[in-house]
């Protein structure tokens, strides 16, 4: 049902990385506009992206209020130029999104190796603690602030001269690994939330190798 020549949105999809969260849908509008509503299970629906011809809506500001809640969004379709018009049920045509729980489902963004420092046969590798759009007391929280010990990093490292990879894990943002003296190593890290069932791992960080700018070498 619905207003003549108005079609319901479909393929509603959440796109979320490090809590930056956008709802996307189809189709591209022809003689219609969309308004999005989002709610937790409280049913207190909040309207966003009023009468837009876009097929996406940034809902980050809403979901960061409580990333552990489960959200539902719905996209209403209205005839262009006649947004008061409703369907035969007295309501505009709409479609619901899948449920979305940011804490459990937001994709982990590609991490970045902030620095590495060699002291003798030890190398300290530090992962950048990326800022999110989640706020507490008017300050933006980092990924570690939000996830705490639920978030671990896996370090992959190998001698520049060989392909055999080793791994290390940490529930902080730092690794301290043993290396062979006089050898150059390359590093890549991956963010992981082991307790998750979906979106458990990020993509690997860009590779960083010793002997390049990010590193510092100190012979003891």
């Amino acid at each position: 049902s619905g207003t003549t020549n108005t079609v319901a949105a479909y393929n509603l999809t959440w796109k979320s990385t490090n809590f930056k969260t956008i709802l996307e849908w189809e189709p591209k509008p022809v003689n219609q506009v969309y308004t999005v509503q989002i709610s937790t299970k409280s049913g207190d629906w909040k309207s966003k992206c009023f009468y837009t011809t876009d097929t996406e809506c940034d809902l980050t500001d809403e979901i960061v209020k409580d990333v552990k809640q489960t959200y539902l969004a719905r996209v209403f379709s209205y005839p262009a130029g006649n947004v008061e018009s409703t369907g035969s049920a007295g309501e505009p045509l709409y479609e619901n999104s899948p449920e979305f729980t940011p804490y459990l489902e937001t994709n982990l963004g590609q991490p970045t190796i902030q620095s590495f420092e060699q002291v003798g046969t030890k190398v300290n590798v530090t992962v950048e603690d990326e800022r999110t759009l989640v706020r507490r007391n008017n300050t933006f929280l980092s990924l570690r602030d939000v996830f705490g010990k639920d978030l671990i990093y896996t370090l992959y490292y190998w001698k520049s001269s060989s392909s055999g990879k080793k791994t290390a894990k940490t529930n902080t943002n730092e690794f301290l690994i043993d290396v062979d003296k006089g050898e150059n190593y390359c590093f890549s890290v991956q963010a992981v939330i082991p307790s998750r069932t979906v979106n458990r791992k990020s993509t690997d960080s860009p590779v960083e190798c010793m002997g390049q700018e990010k590193g510092e070498f100190r012979e003891i």
């Epitope: 049902s1 709610s39 409280s42 207190d44 629906w45 479609e95 619901n96």
Partner: antibody
Amino acid sequence: EVQLLESGGGLVQPGGSLRLSCAASGFTFNNYAMSWVRQAPGKGLEWVSSISGSGGRTYYADSVKGRFTISRDNSKNTLFLQMNSLRAEDTAVYYCAKTPWGYYFDYWGQGTLVTVSS
Amino acid sequence: DIQMTQSPSSLSASVGDRVTITCRASQGISSRLAWYQQKPEKAPKSLIYAASSLQSGVPSRFSGSGSGTDFTLTISSLQPEDFATYYCQQYNSYPYTFGQGTKLEIK
């Protein structure tokens, strides 16, 4: 464990009033919309009213609009239904139900019987 | 208002049978449909929401399907505790409405 316990039902004369209560436990009450659904003796289910988690949005069936008022006290985890100008056709078991997104009824109380008769 | 029509109104079946109950909406409701089970003198119990999503704790022999106007509830292998009355409910728009119920009895 989610528990919903209704109270306040009873026998009332036509034109009279009753206030039903529903004490909720086992979940974060203000995170959920809540509803009242009724069932006349030997009949099917009829949605009566719903209220959002904040209490800011309320919805009513046409059959009770203007006579019934749904409300909630989130500090006491309690849902209410104030029923005025009661009629014989309001006789039913009244259930309170947890209502995610204000959509469907995932947990129900055991019900309280309201009888409107002279 | 959206009318919900269930069929059959009553149904006799045996333990182990596969049973299907249908629900038809008077207009399209997408997947905004729930199913409930009610036993005599008891409160209803949620089985399915969003037409096909199984409520937590409900046995997997229950399944729902459909979209638009036609929906089905299927019990793949009837158990003794499944004899009850089943209701569908639309939550596409207010007022929310239920089907008249399907009473599932022992043959």
